[in-house]
Interface confidence: low
């Protein structure tokens, strides 16, 4: 999906008002210095690409983020403020329904959500680094 057509300010508002708090809730009890940020992004469309990938694509050791509150709100924000996004996600949603039976918080998931927090911060103020 090409995220260059999204309404970035509206997505930013959604992040600041709710998604950020849900991410903090998920990470509660974890030191902010516990994980190093290894995923980066250079501008807002690129950040959304990385955020979508980390939030909705199952990874080794963490296959359960899509049903978290922050993920559902992220999906809603992208669906509302990125034209045509919903249509591209129909097949992906079917796959997620099959893959995610229960919510399990693993250390790998905590690390992944820590990366998401960094990506969202960069989305709010892109650092314009070489991709």
């Amino acid at each position: 999906y090409d995220f260059t057509n999204c309404d970035f300010e509206k997505i930013k508002a959604a992040y600041l008002s709710t998604i950020s708090k849900d991410l903090i809730t998920y990470m509660s009890g974890t030191k902010s210095t516990e994980f190093n940020n290894t995923v980066s992004c250079s501008n807002r469309p690129h950040c959304l690409t990385e955020i979508q990938s980390l939030t909705f694509n199952p990874t080794a050791g963490c296959a359960s983020l899509a049903k978290e509150m922050f993920a559902m709100k992220t999906k809603a924000a992208l669906a509302i403020w990125c034209p045509g996004y919903s249509e591209t996600q129909i097949n992906a949603t079917q796959a997620m329904k099959k893959a995610r039976k229960s919510k399990v918080t693993t250390n790998k998931c905590l690390e992944q959500v820590s990366q998401l927090q960094g990506l969202w911060r960069r989305f709010n103020r892109p650092l314009l680094k070489q991709q």
Epitope: T4, N43, L128, Q131
Partner: antibody, heavy 117, light 107 residues
């Protein structure tokens, strides 16, 4: 209203230095990167480098690494570009421009720097 | 570094003409391209960003499109105030580079 107001024209001798200022207003200075672009007479646009006003992190293209210094004064929302060891080919209009995603939505009015013996 | 090759370098057109300017990137830059208009003695003005998004206040006769690594700026019906020089610029990470410019002159 967003504005980037640059300092006035400069005439310098070869080997001298010039410091161009760019005062920002109408937005939060530290939210946007400040880039510098120059344009030699009758020529195209050349990207020089950029500075993050929040922490002064700077990126310069190779050809300017030894001669350009980018700084900011957050208290006055002003960005500066200093070019040293001036030569005749540095004669150009120097622009500051703000950016969030890499494209420039606001530009300064330009500062003409003439290098002549 | 990513090279931006802009063509033509100049063109002559009449008021009401449809004008097309192209810019080719030396590698894939996705939709990370902006177009600017510059008039003599003035700063460049943003026209289009993300290849096809019109900047605020820009007339709808301007449009941008992308096909692979080739980008196009189209002016559907040239107006007197559109005679200027146009530049493309990629914004896909450092270093930013501009095309060589296209001067649109009155025929």
């Amino acid at each position: 209203e967003v504005q980037l107001v640059q300092s006035g024209a400069e005439v310098k001798k070869p080997g001298a230095s010039v410091k161009v200022s760019c005062k920002a207003s109408g937005y939060t200075f530290t939210t946007y990167w400040m880039h510098w672009v120059r344009q030699a007479p009758g020529q195209g646009l050349e990207w020089m480098g950029m500075i993050d006003p929040s922490d002064s992190e700077t990126t310069l293209i190779q050809k300017f690494k030894d001669r350009v210094t980018l700084t900011v004064d957050k208290s006055t929302s002003t960005a500066y570009m200093e070019l040293s060891s001036l030569r005749s080919e540095d004669t150009a209009v120097y622009y500051c421009a703000r950016t969030l995603d890499g494209y420039y939505d606001y530009w300064g009015q330009g500062t003409t720097v003439t290098v002549s013996s | 570094d990513i090279q931006m090759t802009q063509s033509p370098s100049s063109l002559s057109a009449s008021v009401g003409d449809r004008v097309t300017i192209t810019c080719r990137a030396s590698e894939n830059i996705y939709s990370y391209l902006a177009w600017y208009q510059q008039k003599p003695g003035k700063s460049p003005q943003l026209l289009v960003y993300f290849a096809k998004t019109l900047a605020e206040g820009v007339p709808s006769r301007f449009s941008g499109s992308v096909s692979g690594t080739q980008f196009t700026l189209t002016i559907s019906s040239l107006q007197p105030e559109d005679f200027a020089t146009y530049y493309c610029q990629h914004h896909y990470g450092t270093p930013w580079t501009f095309g060589g410019g296209t001067k649109v002159e009155i025929k």
